[in-house]
């Protein structure tokens, strides 16, 4: 079941899953000046049985102006390295670290993508919250949000995450702040 | 199930200082951030500011910068709003509310300033 | 500071008529806003928030809709328990402020 809405922003805030449960589509959009192959999928999609859960289609972008030519899907290493986003919590660390069965993980990038990724997330799934460079967590609640589906309708929980700019906390004598997670992801994903 | 419990009302001389409590209980207190509200008779909701349950951390609007100090005591669940050189334009009803999106409230305690 | 402008100030409606509650923000405030209704002498209770989720418990007749400065809260057929006050409010950044309110009398 595919979640109604985006998962909820917060400001000053950037969001990302870990790991994408089957029935996950991902759009297959461009940059600015290149277009889908004519024969390409419009999506991708995460599926799998019980053993493997992996990304169905590949998404291929040609450039508008070149009527003929297709461009391989092959990242290069620099893009691959300006994709790779910091990790944002301890629970994403360890996700990262092992297969969590029905899930397929990020998909790499392919040549001549769209800046954001556009996400249709499914009922269960988890995005995990981060503030953005230059912002603090004033409040770190619970940092995530869990698409849930409740009385026939679909609705992701709040995140009680708290970012803010302001420089000088009004921090009380013998109180320190906790550690503050790495600052920022360098790009948002949204869902639609 | 939730619940937020506030001090009972107070009546105070200008000048001087109150402090109001919020007492949380049926969920993880450090989870939610609390927030301090007030409304004047008659009036509109003022936001106050916004503490960490978590972190003590807090934000205050610029209005009350310098006469407000919002602190929490975790081993009690409970919140705190201190207002200091009380005058008779702080007579209100003062509410705490949780989280990001304000989801449950206290019931308000009033503050009557007065010589 | 975000300003909150709600119109209108009072309005008076019968039972099973459908009620509409404007909230207009003073910059884009995406859709980091919430309806709260309060009863004369209780504390406010949150109707929807994000601009269009309804809150736990709250009949469907309350609706929310709107994104960027221009916000509304329907309530599709008014019952006698709906008098109160409602005010719009956001939380896209602090200070979070809210509307001056919105005064629904059953006639």
């Known amino acids: 079941e595919l979640c109604d809405d985006d998962p909820p922003k917060i400001t000053h805030a950037t969001f990302k899953a870990v790991a994408y449960k089957e029935g996950t589509m991902l759009n297959c959009e461009c940059k600015r000046g290149f277009r889908r192959i004519k024969s390409g999928s419009p999506y991708m999609l995460c599926t799998g049985n019980s053993s493997h859960s992996s990304w169905d289609n590949q998404c291929q972008c040609t450039s508008s102006a070149a009527r003929n030519t297709t461009k391989q899907v092959t990242p290069q290493p620099e893009e691959q390295k300006e994709r790779k986003t910091t990790e944002m919590q301890s629970q994403m660390q360890l996700a990262d670290q092992v297969s969590l069965p029905g899930h397929c993980r990020e998909p790499p990038p392919w040549e001549n993508e769209a800046t954001e990724r556009i996400y249709h997330f499914v009922v269960g799934q988890t995005v995990y919250y981060q503030c953005v460079q230059g912002y603090r967590a004033l409040h770190r609640g619970p940092a995530e949000s869990v698409c849930k589906m409740t009385h026939g309708k679909t609705r992701w929980t709040q995140p009680q995450l708290i970012c803010t700019g302001e420089t000088e906390p009004s921090q009380f004598p013998g109180e320190e702040e906790p550690q503050a997670s790495p600052d920022g992801l360098p790009e948002s994903e949204t869902s639609r | 199930q939730v619940q937020l419990v506030q001090s009972g009302a107070e009546v105070k001389k200008p000048g001087a200082s109150v402090k109001v409590s919020c007492k949380a209980s049926?969920?993880?207190?450090?989870?939610?951030?609390m927030h301090w509200v007030r409304q004047a008779p008659g009036q509109g909701l003022e936001w106050m500011g916004v503490i960490s349950t978590y972190s003590g951390d807090a934000i205050y609007a610029q209005k009350f910068q310098g006469r407000v100090t919002m602190t929490r005591d975790t081993s009690t669940s409970t919140v705190y709003m201190e207002l200091s050189s009380l005058r008779s334009e702080d007579t209100a009803v003062y509410y705490c509310a949780r989280g990001v999106t304000f989801d449950y409230w206290g019931q308000g305690t009033t503050v009557t300033v007065s010589s | 500071d975000i300003q909150m402008t709600q119109s209108p100030s009072s309005l008076s409606a019968s039972v099973g008529d459908r009620v509409t509650i404007t909230c207009r923000a003073s910059?884009?405030?995406?859709?980091?806003l919430e309806w709260y209704q309060q009863k004369p002498g209780k504390a406010p209770k949150l109707l929807v928030y994000?601009?269009?989720t309804l809150a736990e418990g709250v009949p469907s007749r309350f609706s929310g809709s709107g994104s960027g400065t221009d916000f509304t809260l329907t309530i599709s057929s008014l019952q006698p328990e709906d008098f109160g006050t409602y005010y719009c409010q956001h939380h896209y950044d602090t200070p979070y402020t809210f509307g001056q309110g919105t005064k629904l009398e059953i006639k």
């Open positions: 049926g969920y993880t207190f450090t989870d939610y951030a």
């Open positions: 994000n601009a269009k």
């Open positions: 910059q884009d405030i995406s859709n980091y």
